[in-house]
């Protein structure tokens, strides 16, 4: 016997559906109506036939009361080929729900997204996460998707993007966006970062994550941030192969005074990079290749310094910097 495609936990909190059959019984998903967090994995299916069964142009207000009764706050949809018209239809209906967090992963969006009708209500998400989502529309996908969302989005995460650069002239500002995560886009690089950080479109960013994004030097990242007018409080550059030295011909970059936390862990550093901010609250240099304790003049003025997992650190060695946070135990790096 084949396992049930959908499983609801005994507290009506989490519901997970794995539709792997070629002709899935989508009605099984109805058991998720009372769940707060819902995950639907469509097994790589092409959802094109759905368009024949649903009226994507129907007024979503007719479903408003039904959708309002859903408890779902967080929805994950993955592994499918989705016509843009169907995605838009779903977003229009979900605008009447309590949905706050939407994750789309391993999706291929086909066709173009129609413009938002004047009477339509945008989806009031606080968090949107995309992983390995491809769009037929190329660089304009973010602007097209954005029009279906209310302007209150706080967290945007885009990983394994097929087109991490955006059509900046079409993108509207994200006035409430405080966290932007572009991690796991190894082809991004510093030039790509400049293209992705559309100038003045991200005025409220406090946390910027750039793990595994092909960044080369902290100074290059500083320049990209300065060009975009982005002033994060926290910057994560971990899991990049960073160079410690700066190109002498490159102009010196002044970091924003707003930056107080910098993560440079797992960056393959053999020495402390040049051109770091002069003052930081938190600096993480753990799991690098530092062969000697950094000298005070190599480091910013820092309250919390983490150096765990570097070769020079042997358990029991005196702490190399006042206020450092080393455990004395070499972590699994």
């Amino acid at each position: 016997t084949t396992p049930e495609p959908c499983e609801l936990d005994d507290e009506d909190f989490r519901c997970v559906c794995n539709f792997s059959e070629p002709q899935p019984d989508w009605s099984e998903a109805f058991q998720c109506v009372s769940a707060v967090e819902v995950e639907i994995h469509a097994g790589g299916l092409n959802l094109e036939p759905f368009l024949k069964r649903v009226d994507a142009d129907a007024d979503p207000r007719q479903y408003a009361d039904t959708v309002k009764a859903l408890r779902v706050r967080r929805l994950t949809v993955g592994a499918a080929q989705v016509p843009a018209q169907l995605l838009v239809g779903a977003l229009r209906v979900l605008a009447y729900s309590r949905l706050k967090e939407l994750t789309l992963e391993d999706l291929k969006i086909t066709g173009t997204m129609p413009p938002l009708p004047l009477e339509a209500t945008g989806l009031a998400l606080s968090s949107l996460r995309l992983r390995n989502v491809s769009w037929a529309t190329g660089r304009s996908w973010l602007a097209e998707l954005q029009q279906w969302l209310k302007p209150g989005l706080k967290v945007l995460s885009i990983a394994q993007a097929h087109s991490p650069a955006f059509s900046c002239e079409q993108v509207r500002a994200f006035p409430a966006l405080t966290s932007l995560d572009l991690s796991d886009n190894p082809g991004l690089g510093e030039r790509g970062l400049m293209a992705a950080l559309c100038p003045h479109k991200f005025p409220a960013i406090q946390n910027l994550a750039l793990r595994n994004t092909g960044m080369e030097t902290p100074t290059g990242v500083c320049a990209a941030l300065a060009a975009a007018g982005v002033q994060p409080h926290s910057l994560d550059l971990s899991h990049n192969s960073l160079r410690a030295t700066v190109n002498p011909s490159a102009p010196r970059c002044m970091w924003s005074s707003a930056l107080n936390s910098l993560n440079l862990s797992f960056a393959g550093l053999e020495q402390v990079p040049k051109g770091l901010p002069a003052k930081l609250r938190v600096l993480d240099l753990s799991c690098n290749r530092l062969n000697r304790a950094p000298q005070p003049d190599e480091l910013p003025e820092v309250d919390n310094l983490t150096l765990d997992g570097n070769p020079f650190l042997v358990p029991g060695t005196a702490l190399p910097h006042e206020g450092s946070m080393n455990s004395g135990v070499v972590p699994a790096c």
């Epitope: 936990d9 507290e11 009506d12 909190f13 989490r14 109506v33 009372s34 707060v36 967090e37 009764a69 859903l70 408890r71 706050r73 967080r74 309590r98 967090e101 968090s127």
Partner: antibody
Framework: QLQLQESGPGLVKPSETLSLTCTVS?????????WNWIRQPPGKGLEWIGY???????SYNPSLKSRVTISRDTSKNQFSLKLSSVTAADTAVYYC????????WGQGTLVTVSS | DIQLTQSPSSLSASVGDRVTITCRAS??????????LHWYQQKPGKAPKLLIY???NLQSGVPSRFSGSGSRTDFTLTISSLQPEDVATYYC?????????FGQGTKLEIK
């Protein structure tokens, strides 16, 4: 058998940040459910503060949202509460609780806000 | 926010009495087939204990003299035959919509 245990300072000064940790045994905080903080001022009723879910998603009571952060450390199977800018009105017994029908509770820890 | 109002605020009854506590919600706490309304018992100095979940389901280990009923906005907790150990404060709570809210409590004493 699932068990939850609150820990943290019993006395916090006004305007400072209250920090509590809940250690969970007999179940994983990253495999299912919501992991809540609920408080009860002396002689009063219960108030839900917020939760962090198995996925890391958080939800907070709007009345406290600007002051609350709930985070987790999955390696230690712990979740934590930070409540900033506390006043005497934040004096309460703080409970960590599993689920949204609150079937599993810690024994509670009294936090007094006083100078 | 969904407000929950319990009545009475306190009551005194004799051992063996049938006791009823009501909880009224400011809006429906139903989601399709289920009512997300739960009942708790709290004894002095102790954490609350779940008695009834989703309006009418008895939590494992709870004596069968406790029962719950109701839907949408009106709910009832019934103790069919009051026992001395039932002296406590009883709370209703909704988990249909965040913020998740509690009733103000009903204090039950023995005459």
């Amino acid at each position: 058998q699932l068990q939850l245990q609150e820990s943290g300072p019993g006395l916090v000064k006004p305007s400072e940040t209250l920090s509590l940790t809940c250690t969970v045994s007999g179940g994983s905080i990253s495999s299912d459910s919501a992991w809540n903080w609920i408080r009860q001022p002396p002689g009063k009723g219960l108030e839900w503060i917020g939760y962090i879910s198995y996925s890391g998603s958080t939800s907070y009571n709007p009345s406290l949202k600007s002051r609350v952060t709930i985070s987790r450390d999955t390696s230690k199977n712990q979740f934590s509460l930070k409540l900033s800018s506390v006043t005497a009105a934040d004096t309460a017994v703080y409970y960590c609780v599993r689920g949204l029908r609150f079937a599993y509770w810690g024994q509670g820890t009294l936090v007094t806000v006083s100078s | 926010d969904i407000q929950l109002t319990q009545s009475p605020s306190s009551l005194s009854a004799s051992v063996g009495d049938r006791v009823t506590i009501t909880c009224r919600a400011s809006e429906s706490v139903d989601s399709y087939v289920d009512s997300f309304l739960h009942w708790y018992q709290q004894k002095p100095g102790k954490a609350p204990k779940l008695l009834i979940y989703r309006a009418s389901n008895l939590q494992s280990g709870v004596p069968s003299r406790f029962s719950g009923s109701g839907s949408r906005t009106d709910f009832t907790l019934t103790i069919s035959s009051l026992q001395p150990e039932d002296v406590a404060t009883y709370y209703c709570q909704q988990s249909n919509e965040d913020p998740y809210t509690f009733g103000q409590g009903t204090k039950l004493e023995i005459k």
